[in-house]
Amino acid sequence: EKLPKAPVITTPLETVDALVEEVATFMCAVESYPQPEISWTRNKILIKLFDTRYSIRENGQLLTILSVEDSDDGIYCCIANNGVGGAVESCGALQVKMKPKITRPPINVKIIEGLKAVLPCTTMGNPKPSVSWIKGDNALRENSRIAVLESGSLRIHNVQKEDAGQYRCVAKNSLGTAYSKLVKLEVEVFARILRAPESHNVTFGSFVTLRCTAIGIPVPTISWIENGNAVSSGSIQESVKDRVIDSRLQLFITKPGLYTCIATNKHGEKFSTAKAAATVSIAEWSKSQKDSQGYCAQYRGEVCDAVLAKDALVFFNTSYRDPEDAQELLIHTAWNELKAVSPLCRPAAEALLCNHLFQECSPGVVPTPMPICREYCLAVKELFCAKEWQAMEGKAHRGLYRSGMHLLPVPECSKLPSMHRDPTACTRLPYLDYKKENITTFPSITSSRPSADIPNLPASTSSFAVSPAYSMT
């Protein structure tokens, strides 16, 4: 009779390399008496006998993985036990080998010049594939701007026009090579002004041609603005060559003005804009103008930024030591006073105060401020802010305000020029043009004035996009 013998594994498990979808077999030869019970584990988890992905034969000595998957890699162990002595164990690794596979291929990309572009290329494979990129017909070289990331993705910093083209990624290991489909990188370029219009000082009645050249991808469109409004007279000629647009505005000069060239192009849902301005002043213009102590310049402050036309020149009164600062403080103080007024009144009052303290300016030989048109002042006083204005005047009469209306730097409407007499001699408030079309209920006006004085504002001569600050609740 045979003597009992503890199990001995005569053929230890070895590392097995297998390709995906192929068969992989581990052999665990055991000598023992009586016959041992052999169990198998993967990563220390028991493999169940009835798992159809495996075949266990030869009394458990042969484990076959019928169709290897990527997730099958790990440490496989056989454990033999027959009750004599201790159980014995042998382990080996399964290394799943895999041809390169691109799991997340690159896609077509539109990107704005100067931004960062990332073309994805996520791969699988064992050994881990190396990823390279091809642009057009040539291998892409990495440099300070262009890098292939650890993930395989291509990152291009500060994208340039010359980066545009067709790209594909290549994943390679010892078992083979995979190519992505060709994708297109399109580089869009913000509108940029190449040649700004030049300022002119001319005699009354002269012809002047202002020229503005812009570039961009897609090719920009050019529009012209005169003192904050669309150009109402003059002829425009345009030509396009090699993504460069050239626009020429010919004008007959009867008054000074600030002319702004605006180049715009579209990037998806967004627009990019570039601006350049030129002044046309009239020599000897001062003869018909009253002498004013001040200068014309752009507004640099914060408070009226959303109210004043972006490119407009405004008047700074040099009777103040620091005109910019003094006028900004006045408007800031006024702004705080306006916090208490109604949502109907506040934006109208803001438009009035900003345009009154920072009056549009004609930059002739003698800088001349352009006051607000009387009709717009009255619209604020008797329409938008009727209640507030009356309350303020009432408090002034009762001595609650020492200086009455002068607590706010409010213009005296009756002293302002009428737009019906000379539309070019005063400033409109575009906000009111826009808003009067949208007001369905007017505040009750109990005014001592004859009803004829309640303003009838003209139809707006230009479209005016209301700032979000002007939304009314």
């Epitope: 700004a196 030049e198 350049a276 310049a297 752009q298 640099r300 914060e302 910019e324 403080l329």
Partner: antibody, heavy 121, light 112 residues
């Protein structure tokens, strides 16, 4: 005597962060706009950021937008510049400068002595 | 974006007059650019000289004057002194899509 004293500079690795401070004294801090201006070694001056007297708006040079944040604490008479995702090209002496008026933009009439920021691995 | 241009270097004899200019790569410098001028001597922080085209900062000698001439801003030093040897920077306010303050590359002035 009017004084602006910067601090917080030092050596930092690319991608790192620093917070610069500028302590003001000798003037009414909350009456003036402030700016940060930098100067790379051997190079010219470069405006970085500005803030008006009340902190109501902030303005930045295009290349630092989204990475740098200017702020001020008028009670502490201090101006700050929080710098994130630093790059080697941000290496410079950073000056804190006082505006001659309330608004953010305009002439800078007083400057600190600067603090050196070095971005290097 | 427009680049602010300055002469890289200039020289002047003591007592002489020199004009430094500040232009824009595209377009003209106007009062709306509020030209400012700064002086920086080696190892020192900059100091303001001229603001808003032609106003002198307090304590700045009257030999420094600012103007707009043609399509450029100009800083004129009349009766240059040895201590005027320094780097001079002009700065312009710009408004395109956002507000910016842009310095020129600087002019190295040598008083021979």
């Amino acid at each position: 005597e009017l004084q602006l004293v910067e601090s917080g500079g030092g050596l930092v690795q690319p991608g790192g962060s620093l917070r610069l401070s500028c302590a003001a004294s000798g003037f009414t801090f909350d009456d003036y706009g402030m700016s940060w201006v930098r100067q790379a070694p051997g190079k010219g001056l470069e405006w970085v950021s500005a803030i008006p007297w009340n902190g109501g708006s902030t303005y930045y040079k295009e290349s630092v937008k989204g990475r740098f944040t200017i702020s001020r604490d008028n009670a502490k008479k201090t101006l700050y510049l929080q710098m994130n995702s630093l790059k080697s090209e941000d290496t410079a002496v950073y000056y804190c400068a006082k505006r001659s008026g309330r608004i953010a933009f305009g002439a800078l009439d007083a400057w600190g002595q600067g603090t050196l920021v070095t971005v290097s691995s | 974006q427009a680049v602010v241009t300055q002469e890289p270097s200039l020289s002047v004899s003591p007592g002489g007059t020199v004009t430094l200019t500040c232009g824009l790569s595209s377009g003209s410098v106007t009062a709306s650019n509020y030209p400012d001028w700064y002086q920086q001597t080696p190892g020192q922080a900059p100091r303001g000289l001229i603001y808003s085209t032609d106003s002198r900062h307090s304590g700045v000698p009257s030999r420094f004057s600012g103007s707009i001439s043609g399509n450029k801003a100009a800083l004129t030093i009349t009766g240059a002194q040895p201590e005027d040897e320094a780097d001079y920077y002009c700065a312009l306010y710009m408004y395109s899509d956002s507000k910016l303050y842009v310095f020129g590359g600087g002019t190295k002035l040598t008083v021979l």
